[in-house]
Structure formats: C-alpha cells, structure tokens
Amino acid sequence: ALDTNYCFSSTEKNCCVRQLYIDFRKDLGWKWIHEPKGYHANFCLGPCPYIWSLDTQYSKVLALYNQHNPGASAAPCCVPQALEPLPIVYYVGRKPKVEQLSNMIVRSCKCS
Amino acid sequence: ALDTNYCFSSTEKNCCVRQLYIDFRKDLGWKWIHEPKGYHANFCLGPCPYIWSLDTQYSKVLALYNQHNPGASAAPCCVPQALEPLPIVYYVGRKPKVEQLSNMIVRSCKCS
C-alpha cells in the first residue's frame, strides 16, 4: 500500500504519500481553530505509471494510453485514498469545544 | 456538476471532463476486443482552485493551502468522479462473448 509506513521510509519516485505540515493561521488563514496550531496533513505526489496502484479499470486504461502516447495530457493522477479525522479545539464564546474534523489527514494514496 | 453536459458545452479552464477517444489497438495495444474498435473514454483535466468541486474536507484544506502557497507542489488534482461501464464483444475460440467492462467511461470529475 502507498501508505505512510512505506512512503515515509522510502525514496519512492512514483505516486506516494508525502509529508506536509499545515499551519492553520499561516497556511490557511484560519484563526478559529485554537488547538492544534497546525497538523501533519500530508499530500499525494508522483507519477502514475502502468500498474502502479491503479484505482479502477479506467485508471489502468488511461495509464496504458499514456504509455503509448507519452506526450498526452491525459494521465492518471496521484490522489488520497485513506483519510483520517483530526481532533480540534475551538471556542464558542468563552467555552472550548472539541470536535473531530473528518477527512483531514492523508494516510495513503492511489492513482485515479 | 463537472459532467459531460456542462464541460463539453463550455470552455471551462478549471477541472472538467474532457473528450478523449481511445483506440484499443493503437492506443492500448489490445487486440482481444472485437467490438467496439475504440470508445469515448474521456479524461479529467484542469486546475483545482479553492471551492471548485472539492471532494473532501482535505481537498478544501489543500486548495486553500495552495492559494496561500502558490509555489507549492501540494495541490488537489482533477480526477474521475462518476464512471460508467462499456459493453464489449470478444471471442473465446470462435464464440463471441458480450461483457460489460466496469468503470471505463468518465462522466464527471472532481478535485481530490
């Protein structure tokens, strides 16, 4: 699987999950989240050659098409597969609230 | 929706489904499919700015991150959303077989 266990410990050039730290204020302009100040969101990056963790029959077709037509702009793209929630603290008035923001952290990628 | 109805009739620059015809022999090297000789597979292409048909909370975060950090390589990608099957005819010996190949045609796209 193109997950953090594999991707963070390798020098994989193809589609893989990469490390990305996002600071809520600096990178998003969000001041409403009190904690955490930022988080390891990660992101997906890398080419999607034929047979590399392809998502659907269409992805396989498109990767093969791209192999036969190297100059084409049609190619599969490396995108998130497994996402995890992030617990946050924000304030309603003076009262702190804890909430889980769903689908915030990328754990693995796929070629779609 | 970023579907064929909207995208094929507009000059949309952002993520949208684009026309792509794939010839099984020429583009994939497949000789086993007897009919059709090719099909309109389509593909997804275009930038994914903030709020443009974003798939998950993570996609929104990444698009906003990209807006604040324009030079970053982390950005959402335009990928298939709705896929449709393609009926094909192939031969087993001298006997023609009809089969539906699932997830072969892109009908709409999303930013993931």
């Epitope: 730290y21 600071d23 204020r25 600096k26 001041k31 009190h34 904690e35 955490p36 100040k37 930022g38 390891h40 617990p87 603290v89 702190p96 804890v98 | -």
Partner: antibody, heavy 117, light 107 residues
Framework: QVQLQQSGAELVKPGASVKISCKAS????????MNWVKQRPGKGLEWIGQ????????NYNGKFKGKATLTADKSSSTAYMQLSSLTSEDSAVYFC??????????WGQGTTLTVSS | DIQMTQSPASLSVSVGETVTITCRAS??????LAWYQQKQGKSPQLLVY???NLADGVPSRFSGSGSGTQYSLKINSLQSEDFGSYYC?????????FGGGTKLEIK
Amino acid sequence: QVQLQQSGAELVKPGASVKISCKASGYAFSSSWMNWVKQRPGKGLEWIGQIYPGDGDTNYNGKFKGKATLTADKSSSTAYMQLSSLTSEDSAVYFCARHYDGSTDYWGQGTTLTVSS
Amino acid sequence: DIQMTQSPASLSVSVGETVTITCRASENIYSNLAWYQQKQGKSPQLLVYAATNLADGVPSRFSGSGSGTQYSLKINSLQSEDFGSYYCQHFWGTPYTFGGGTKLEIK
C-alpha cells in the same frame, strides 16, 4: 539555523517593572507563536503565555494575567515580555520558546530576574 | 485547565538501566504532548513531540508512547548524559501546563 537570544540578567526593586526581550533569527518570526515560560530556582516549569507576532494575538495563563504583558516587534523579529508590580515571587529564570508542531522546539538561553530591595 | 500529573518525582538509577516516566492528563489531550530534558542551569531540550515523534538529533534510546490521558517516556540503556530533569507538557488548549518534573539521578 533557528536561534532565540534573550536579554541579560536583571536586578530590580520590588514594585518596579521589567521588560525582557527575545530576538529570533533563522525562521519566519511573524508566523510562529512565541511562548514564555517561568522557572523558579529549584522548581518546575510554568507556562506564562504566547503571542503570534503576525497579528499580535495573545493567550495567557490566567495566573499571569495582569502580571505579564506580551508584545512583539516584527521589524526587529523580537518578542518582549513585560512583568509589572514585581515581588520576590517573580524572581525566576524566564524562557522564550518557539511553538512548532505541538511542542516548543527551540528555547532561548533564559533571563534571570532577581527582585530585591 | 488541564492538569498534568507526572511520576515519579525522582528516580535513582544506574547507567545501562531502562527507565519509564509517566504523565497523566486530567482529560483527553489527543496525543498533543511533548517531553523535554533539562540539565542544571540550561534551557529545556525537546525530546518528543506529538506523544511519539522523536525530535531531530535525539538518540533512538528515547521513545514516547501513549494516547488519551496516559503517556510515557522510556529511556533504554541509560547513558551518563541522560541524567537531569524531565518534563511533559500538553498542547491541548491554553494554558499549556507542564508536569511537575522527574529528577533522574545517578545511583
């Protein structure tokens, strides 16, 4: 590399005020929270508060509200902490520390404050 | 405010031994916890952040674990340079309180 250089030791009289500085270098000062921490001789660490230099936002430990005032000067990449109405209880070492990734990853060398008549 | 209860307060051990220091939070802090080492007269040094991640340059004999309200710092095969004081600190809503500290002494 990241460095936090604090001002020198201070000897002040009870009732007076003092302003401690922390000059940052090696990172984007404006976009990282700066924390301040107190340590009395032979004791543990106490979190005083934090400031976001980019817009001057602050969060204080309730215990230090009215005692400590945090400010920052973006042009010189310097954070300040003013302590007022000093008593012997304020005699301590004060640290500035950069907030990053759910921790304080870089600390200043500490400023010793002695309050004595 | 979230309280951090650190134990033991002091520990007398020999070089080569393994020690575990624990920190209990008064409520769930979702792994937003750091561990520091402080030598006499020096600034604290970050060892572990986000409960389990080793800070740059920290030897692999140090490890952090835990979740929810219970966290621990383990030091395998103690070296002479490991003696000093250790503190945990939560980062789950201000004030970011510290544990009371653990003084690690040579036996």
